[in-house]
């Protein structure tokens, strides 16, 4: 099922990302540089292990995980979080927890695009990727 996500993806549109980062608690300086970044996302699968790399002028990150198993993650904005990613109806649901807070990132395929929906409390950001 995760095969649909495999490949290299480039960010083509971003909506409400600054407001989402504010709600997450990201500081002004980090928001400024993160908001300017146009990351590529590289997703690969090796057996049970899924790897998601993000590459940009701002920060390069990489996470490798098994669905349903909690792992440690350092996010591009420098949060140290506990993450769990599950597959729910074809949607990769990524929950990050830190400092008593929680945010959910949903990655889903829509037509030829990969749509990433970031939710923190009542604030949602939608970022759309196309194949690079």
């Amino acid at each position: 099922m995760c095969d649909a996500f495999v490949g290299t993806w480039k960010l083509v549109s971003s909506e409400n990302f600054d407001d989402y980062m504010k709600e997450v608690g990201v500081g002004f300086a980090t928001r400024k540089v993160a908001g300017m970044a146009k990351p590529n996302m590289i997703i690969s699968v090796n057996g049970d292990v899924i790897t998601i790399k993000s590459e940009s002028t701002f920060k390069n990150t990489e996470i490798s995980f098994i669905l349903g198993q909690e792992f440690d993650e350092v996010t591009a904005d420098d949060r140290k979080v506990k993450s769990t990613i599950t597959l729910d109806g074809g949607v990769l649901v990524h929950v990050q927890k830190w400092d008593g807070k929680s945010t959910t990132i949903k990655r889903k395929r829509e037509d030829d695009k990969l749509v990433v929906e970031c939710v923190m409390k009542g604030v949602t950001s939608t970022r759309v990727y196309e194949r690079a």
């Epitope: 504010k22 608690g25 500081g27 002004f28 980090t30 540089v33 300017m36 002028t57 920060k59 400092d99």
Partner: antibody
């Protein structure tokens, strides 16, 4: 270990310019903002501006926009602040500090450069 | 700009005394972006508490921080001689970055 090295002191004449340096080591220089802070004798801390070495992007305090110019040399992992048209009001200790992402606080500070503007 | 008002500006505490310093913020900020620094004379500031309540490396556990929205505080559960210093709050939630004017804490 993370270090920010600054010269101890600079003495310059009124009307001149000076370029203060801040050499970083112990981490990936391009991954964190570098901030400059001014402290006049017996006074509090005043933010001058930030520079992100990864892109050269800057964020400046409007008050210092015509006074301070921030640059970096990534090849030597050094941040610079040029202060122009110096007056006695510019005599102060100038600190550079590294900004830790997400929280955006200063997790490492240089020792500060004492700038004296005097004829 | 977001103004940070610290109180008191100057205070003295006896060894063992509980100390609370407050930082009032002119408009609401994220608690993740409110920080405290300790500075002793002739030295650079040191990160002391970040993200409202996280102690920086090496800070004694007698220190704590709390708050949200527009009201924040730094507390020392039991004053010690080495705590005598000036404490500054700082925010970088909204442009421009601002510091409080500082609270000078002396040993009585």
């Amino acid at each position: 270990q993370v270090q920010l090295q600054q010269p101890g002191a600079e003495l310059v004449k009124p009307g001149a310019s000076v370029k203060l340096s801040c050499k970083a080591s112990g981490y990936t220089f391009t991954s964190n903002w570098i901030t400059w802070v001014k402290q006049r004798p017996g006074q509090g801390l005043e933010w001058i501006g930030d520079i992100y070495p990864g892109s050269g992007s800057t964020t400046n305090n409007e008050k210092f926009k015509s006074k301070a110019t921030l640059t970096v040399d990534t090849s030597s992992s050094t941040a610079y602040m040029q202060l122009s048209s110096l007056t006695s009001e510019d005599s102060a200790v100038y600190y550079c500090a590294r900004l830790r992402g997400y929280y955006d606080y200063f997790d490492f500070w240089g020792q500060g450069t004492t700038l004296t503007v005097s004829s | 700009e977001v103004v940070l008002t610290q109180s008191p500006a100057l205070m003295a505490a006896s060894p063992g005394e509980k100390v609370t310093i407050t930082c009032s913020v002119s408009s609401s900020i994220s608690s993740s972006n409110l920080h405290w620094y300790q500075q002793k004379s002739e030295t650079s500031p040191k990160p002391w508490i970040y993200g409202t309540s996280n102690l920086a490396s090496g800070v004694p556990v007698r220190f704590s921080g709390s708050g949200s929205g527009t009201s924040y505080s730094l507390t020392i559960s039991s004053m010690e001689a080495e705590d005598a210093a000036t404490y500054y709050c700082q925010q970088w939630s909204h442009y421009p970055l601002t510091f409080g004017a500082g609270t000078k804490l002396e040993l009585k």
